[in-house]
Structures are given as C-alpha cells and as structure tokens.
C-alpha cells in the first residue's frame, strides 16, 4: 500500500513538475526590466527564451520572436537545449511511469517489469528536473553578470546634460516557476526510485513450493492469497512479490481456471 502511494505521489508530483517546466519554457518573463531606478516606467521590457516583449502604459504589448538562430548568445541556446531536453525526458518519463503504476493493470505485466519501469521513469524525472534547474540557473547567472555589468556602465553616455540610461534586467517569474518545477520533478523522480525498491523482488523471498497430487497438481504459494488449480504447466516455481497480485502463471486463457480468495 505504501509502495503504491509513494509511486502514485511521485507520478503526480513529477506530472506537476513537468507541466511547470513546460510552462516556464514557454513563458515570456524570464528576465524583466529592473524598476529600481524608475518604479513608474511607461515602457516595461521583458524577455523569454523565444521572444522579447514590450508592454506600454497604454496597455499595448508588442512581442518579437528571436528569428535568428546563429545570432543568439550561446548561453541562451544552451538554456533552450537544457529546457527542451528536460521536457522530452520528462514526457518520456511520464509515459513510462503510467505503465509502471501499480494501480494500473496492463495485460500480464510482471511486478519486476513494473519495478524496472518505475526506476527508469524515476531516473528520467531526476535528470529532467536537473536539466530544468541547470537551465534556469545558467540563465539566472547570465542575468546577474549582465546586471552588474550594466550597473557599472549605467550612465555611459553622459555628455553634458544628456543621459543614456541602460535598461537593466532582473529575475522574471519564469525563473521561479522553473526552479520550483525542476525541484518538484526531481522530488517526484526520487519518490519513484524509492517506490521501485518496494516493488522490486528480493532474493530473501520464499520460493514457491509445488505439491503434486495424483489427479491434478495444486500449487501452494506461501504468502499468497490465491490457490490455483492447474491443468497445464501452471506449476512452475514463482517468486511472490505481493500476495494479492496476479502472477504470470495464472494464465487467463484457460477457460476452466478459477481463482479462490
């Protein structure tokens, strides 16, 4: 029960995290104009990974995409790459984890397969979260560097009375969304990995013992709640991971087969 809860919670947390990573990647407010010197500006600038925007006091907002690929800073390209890798890994992780969920029955999938899939998705979520955190942190570092550089050159064009004030940029909402989302995805991934340990077969578990009767064979499985009346090769030894779970030797294609609880 605790394993299922951990796995389910890990999935939900990761789902929220990946949704957040996607939202952050699409958001325009990665960097916003610093309003320290002019808190009542009539023109407000903000930038995202894909376009830059200007919001005027009049209410009009104009956004321009970065139509060049080669002309963009390498750091921005790196951040884009990290975020996209994070999204792709997260999406694959979600897909894998759906099939790995203990509460979802898919055919006659063994618990060992579900454990492996849970671990795989967990690792994917961890890497996805790390990619997002790294991407956001690289961008934040870039902002901090540029901020202090522009502060040093704040009034570069002071010729007589004329002042040329450089626009400084500070952290936008997308950075905080990205950090939180990356953290959630990471936590979700760790939870999935923990759940995997609970799902995985342990070598200390008892081997199934077969008792052969003269007429037909009845397999007694310690720790299990099901006794099978087998007519074919349904008596092969199996490890029991969970008493209530259906194992592969309970083949559903036999019409005369019954389960007793």
């Amino acid at each position: 029960m605790a394993v299922t809860a951990c796995q389910g919670l890990g999935f939900v947390v990761s789902l929220i995290g990946i949704a957040g990573i996607i939202a952050a990647t699409c958001m325009d407010q990665w960097s916003t104009q610093d309003l320290y010197n002019n808190p009542v500006t009539a023109v407000f600038n903000y930038q995202g990974l894909w376009r830059s925007c200007v919001r005027e006091s009049s209410g009009f907002t104009e956004c321009r995409g970065y139509f060049t690929l080669l002309g963009l800073p390498a750091m921005l390209q790196a951040v884009r790459a990290l975020m996209i890798v994070g999204i792709v890994l997260g999406a694959i992780g979600l897909l894998v984890s759906i099939f790995a969920l203990k509460c979802i029955r898919i055919g006659s999938m063994e618990d060992s397969a579900k454990a492996n899939m849970t671990l795989t998705s967990g690792i994917m979520f961890i890497v996805s979260g790390l990619c997002a955190i790294a991407g956001v942190s690289v961008f934040a570092n870039m902002l901090v560097t540029n901020f202090w550089m522009s502060t040093a050159n704040m009034y570069t064009g002071m010729g007589g009375m004329v002042q040329t004030v450089q626009t400084r940029y500070t952290f936008g909402a997308a950075l905080f969304v990205g950090w939180v989302a990356g953290g959630l995805t990471l936590i979700g991934g760790v939870m999935m990995c923990i759940a995997c340990r609970g799902l995985a077969p342990e070598e200390t578990n008892y081997k199934a013992v077969s008792y052969h009767a003269s007429g037909h064979s009845v397999a007694y499985k310690p720790g299990g709640f099901k006794a099978s009346t087998g007519f074919g090769s349904n008596t092969k030894n199996k490890k029991i991971y969970d008493g209530g779970a259906r194992t592969e030797d309970e083949v559903q294609s036999y019409p005369s087969k019954h389960d007793y609880v």
Epitope: V40, T41, A42, N45, S52, V54, E56, G59, R64, V165
Partner: antibody
C-alpha cells in the same frame, strides 16, 4: 467617430474641490488607458494623470500628487478627475485623452475650463 | 524628469516650402527592448484640442497626410512638413512618452510667411 466629452469645469475658490468627468463613446473605452492633460492660457501642455485600462495603476506628476485622483467607471464609459486643495496655478483647460500605441495620446476631448480664483 | 526642449519657438515658412521643427530631450527616449523611440508629435490649432500626428518618433498616425514625417533617435528629433499648406498653421508639440512624468516641449508656432 470617437467622442470624448469633458464636463464639470467652472470657477472655484483656492482650496476648493472640483470633479471633472469625461464621457467616452464610439470606442472600446475599457481597453484604453486614459489620461488628463491641462493647458494654462498661452502655456504648454502639461500631463496631469494617467490610469491603466484595468484601473489597477494610476500615475501623477509631483505637482498634483496627493491632491488629484484619477478614476474610471468602465461600465459607464466615464473617466473622472477629483481635484482637491485647488490652487491658482491649477487654472487651465483640462483635456481627457485616450492612450494608443507608443503611449501616444490618440483621442482627445474638447476640454473643460477650470478657473481657480478668489 | 525628462526635459523637452523645442526649437525654434516660432517659424514662418512660405506655402509649399519645407518646415522643420526640432526637439531635444534631456534623456534618451530609445527603448532597448524594441528599438523604438518614445517620442510623440502633436498639432494644436487655435481653440482646438491637440491632434496626434506621429508616435514612436517616425510612425504616422492614420489619417495624417504624408507630408508630415518624423525622424531622429535617442535625444534628437525632427518633425518635417515637406510642403507647407495653409491648414498646417498651428502650434506643434513634442512629448516624452517613454517615462513618467510625461513631459511636453514648449511648442513651436508655425506661421505662413
């Protein structure tokens, strides 16, 4: 054609109060940030106040801050300017204007004269 | 506050001739975000409210004749009337639309010579 019609101007004593109104028609008033601009006789234009389309932000120059309050009623398509503690230097024709692209004052009313005198 | 200085104070030009009005701001009106200059030009005829001519320093408002053009960047701007018409007699104002408080130039009175 866009119409902005100011009203509420008149003669008032120093220290008195006045409330100007600006009724808008033939344009989507609620989408526009609005401003009040005044012009003293024979003088340059002077910006008085601006309010954002959603009523969330208001801006004033230091000369009127704390004395004037801009507000709007989008349901009634009306802009207001509440003027308190009026001074002789507030005597001017007051225009309401709708802001367009580039923060430019795209639409103007005909103006209403406010005279502050004892 | 950004101070807007217009020159000349008054200008007399013959009909059909070119009229040039200058405007200088104490701070750059160029916004780095969209590379646009937040300078606006207005025309005010006697007894009338101002009328928007040009915004973003060079973008003509719809309905404004193409003889009106704006140019300049940063702190120095120009309004040009390529061929003066009788109906162009008015006072012309430039305005800082970049930062609060919005400020206007002192105006240039344009007359026919």
């Amino acid at each position: 054609e866009v119409m902005l019609l100011e009203s509420g101007g008149g003669l008032v004593q120093p220290g008195g109060s006045l409330r100007l109104s600006c009724a808008a028609s033939e344009f989507t008033f609620s989408n526009y940030a609005m401003s009040w601009v005044r012009q003293a006789p024979g003088k340059r234009l002077e910006w008085v106040a601006t309010i954002s389309s959603g009523r969330s932000s208001t801006y004033y120059p230091d000369s009127v801050k704390g004395r004037f309050t801009i507000s709007r009623d989008n349901a009634k398509n009306t802009l207001y300017l509440q003027m308190n503690s009026l001074r002789a230097e507030d005597t001017a024709v007051y225009y309401c204007a709708g802001l367009g692209r580039g923060n430019a004052m795209e639409y103007w009313g005909q103006g209403t004269l406010v005279t502050v005198s004892s | 506050d950004i101070v807007m200085t217009q020159s000349p104070d008054s200008l007399a030009v013959s009909l059909g001739e070119r009229a040039t009005i200058n405007c200088k701001s104490s701070q750059s009106l160029l916004n780095s975000g969209n590379q646009k200059n937040y300078l606006t030009w207005y025309q005010q005829k006697p007894g009338q409210p101002p009328k928007l001519l040009i915004y973003w320093a060079s973008t003509r408002e719809s309905g404004v004749p193409d003889r009106f053009s704006g140019s300049g960047s940063g702190t120095d701007f120009t309004l040009t009337i390529s061929s003066l018409q009788a109906e162009d007699v008015a006072v012309y104002y430039c305005q800082n639309a970049y930062s609060y408080p919005f400020t206007f130039g002192g105006g240039t009175k344009l007359e026919i010579k």
